[in-house]
């Protein structure tokens, strides 16, 4: 049974899905494979802290150390990438903070995406000095393991020289790499000695070998690509939003809820209200009123604007977001001051997401 009573019948489901949301991402911690990573749970007054990764309980093991409010991952691998959460359990409530861990190398092999510096990799030789192929910039080839999130662009580079100018070809897992081997194909920029794959997917995982050759010799270099898969997850709300606010009677105020969701989120703004002088129904559950929800007739559901407020508008405002996987919610308080007092923005505090408990 639901843990609240609705004051009025409100159609909560959108008649038509609103636009796709991907507004705010949780904080991202990046580590290279093999590195150690330490994250502090950014929640206050925690009696007990529990940790999860992609919704599954996280316990200590030979690489994961949990000490107080700190999570340490030793010798990170791409499998450590994912959506993490720490939950602080207190005597009266609990609160959860989400963050992403991304164990990945730089997206391109030692180079920026635009290849502006590529011209110097194309070395021109004196026509008399015949020379087998050689690497001209080994620094750009040092990172062999590339762990990249799905949908990102990957670039592998093998800057080389030789006389006559060598040719370059690419192998995947030791076999000729053909355009039809991946959806969307790939680009080879010979003047930059690079292979570019856009929007990588897990099937792109493998060993990529550049073979650079001329009539005097052949050299090769192998990169390993690991594509870190995403998992669908429930909505994530930006910490600290909505923020507590205060205004004078007759003033205007705005609450903002920043949402990150892979799947269509359904946003509701809810307020605790009284009915017949009571805040709770006969079943002991609080009376709640849906003030606004995403749908065909609702503009910018992440923002709740209140105009010409009265003292009756004071109280707790809840931003509740759901998708097909689950829910998230955070709340803020509105303080309405008498006209003679000047309003001020209160310190931004995230109220407990477990408001329905």
């Amino acid at each position: 049974r639901p843990s609240f009573s609705l004051v009025e019948d409100t159609t909560l489901e959108p008649e038509e899905p609103p636009t796709k949301y991907q507004i705010s991402q949780p904080e991202v911690y990046v580590a290279a494979p093999g590195e150690s990573l330490e994250v502090r749970c950014l929640l206050k007054d925690a009696a007990v802290i529990s940790w999860t990764k992609d919704g599954v309980h996280l316990g200590p093991n030979n690489r994961t150390v949990l000490i107080g409010e700190y999570l340490q991952i030793k010798g990170a691998t791409p499998r450590d990438s994912g959506l993490y959460a720490c939950t602080a359990s207190r005597t009266v409530d609990s609160e959860t903070w989400y963050f992403m861990v991304n164990v990945t190398d730089a997206i391109s092999s030692g180079d920026d995406e635009d290849d502006t510096d590529g011209a110097e990799d194309f070395v021109s030789e004196n026509s008399n000095n015949k020379r087998a192929p050689y690497w001209t910039n080994t620094e750009k080839m040092e990172k062999r393991l590339h762990a990249v999130p799905a949908a990102n662009t990957v670039k592998f580079r093998c800057p080389a020289g030789g006389n006559p100018m060598p040719t370059m070809r690419w192998l995947k897992n030791g076999k000729e790499f053909k355009q039809e081997h991946r959806i969307g194909g790939y680009k080879v920029r010979n003047q930059h000695w690079s292979l570019i794959m856009e929007s990588v997917v897990p099937s792109d995982k493998g060993n990529y070998t550049c073979v650079v050759e001329n009539e005097y010799g052949s050299i090769n270099h192998t990169y390993h690509l690991d594509v870190v898969e995403r998992s669908p997850h429930r909505p994530i709300l930006q910490a600290g939003l909505p923020a507590n606010a205060s205004t004078v009677v007759g003033g205007d105020v705005e609450f903002v809820c920043k949402v990150y969701s892979d799947a269509q989120p359904h946003i509701q703004w809810i307020k605790h209200v009284e009915k017949n002088g009571s805040k709770y129904g006969p079943d002991g559950l609080p009376y709640l009123k849906v003030l606004k929800h995403s749908g065909i007739n609702s503009s910018n559901a992440e923002v709740l604007a209140l105009f010409n407020v009265t003292e009756a508008d004071a109280g707790e405002y809840i931003c509740k977001v759901s998708n097909y996987i689950g829910q998230a919610n955070q709340s803020a308080w509105l303080t309405v001051l008498p006209k003679q007092q000047a309003p001020g923005r209160e310190k931004e505090i995230t109220a407990s997401p477990d408001y329905l408990e």
Partner: antibody, heavy 114, light 107 residues
Framework: QVQLVQSGAEVKKPGSSVKVSCKAS????????VHWVRQAPGQGLEWIGS????????SYNQNYRGRATITADKSTSTAYMELSSLRSEDTAVYYC???????WGQGTLVTVSS | DIQMTQSPSSLSASVGDRVTITCKAS??????IAWYQQKPGKAPKLLIY???YRYSGVPSRFSGSGSGTDFTFTISSLQPEDIATYYC?????????FGQGTKLEIK
Amino acid sequence: QVQLVQSGAEVKKPGSSVKVSCKASGYIFTSYNVHWVRQAPGQGLEWIGSIYPDNGDSSYNQNYRGRATITADKSTSTAYMELSSLRSEDTAVYYCARGDFAYWGQGTLVTVSS
Amino acid sequence: DIQMTQSPSSLSASVGDRVTITCKASNGISNDIAWYQQKPGKAPKLLIYSASYRYSGVPSRFSGSGSGTDFTFTISSLQPEDIATYYCQQHSTTPYTFGQGTKLEIK
């Protein structure tokens, strides 16, 4: 590992009710919806409804509203789907699935016959 | 409710063939579609979510594409173990509706 284990097969009379259980393990039960989906013999899949165990919020397919009741017990990490006023066309396999539909129960065959 | 129209309802193909199934939504659903494989007597198995993301452990021969109302599911090279019924499902708005299914058989 993540598991959803459902209760056993049931044979019911028309007009009666059935309550199917789905015990979850291997993940945080309160962090995901639990969906209920049914499949009549030789037919396709039909979503009945879902519940968010953390606060009991439930959502239903209009076709089942008033007949289906989905509940959850956080203390035992178990979700339930009760279907009342059974008729022969409710004979189906009933599945529970975790919120992301990545994990499903093994299914519970409910046979409605006089 | 959003209707999901899946086609074809059945198809026969040979091992190694490229197989394509389409799903059309009655309303725009962005990329909120999943594809499932179901074998007789078994629960459905998630293959693709959010239109194009292969779920963990799903072979690379399975892929999905599309956005808005038109979606495609592809098996690049059919294997004998792929014989099953495939369903699309929109997870944009409740009720989360499924397509009627495509039964895939080996020639």
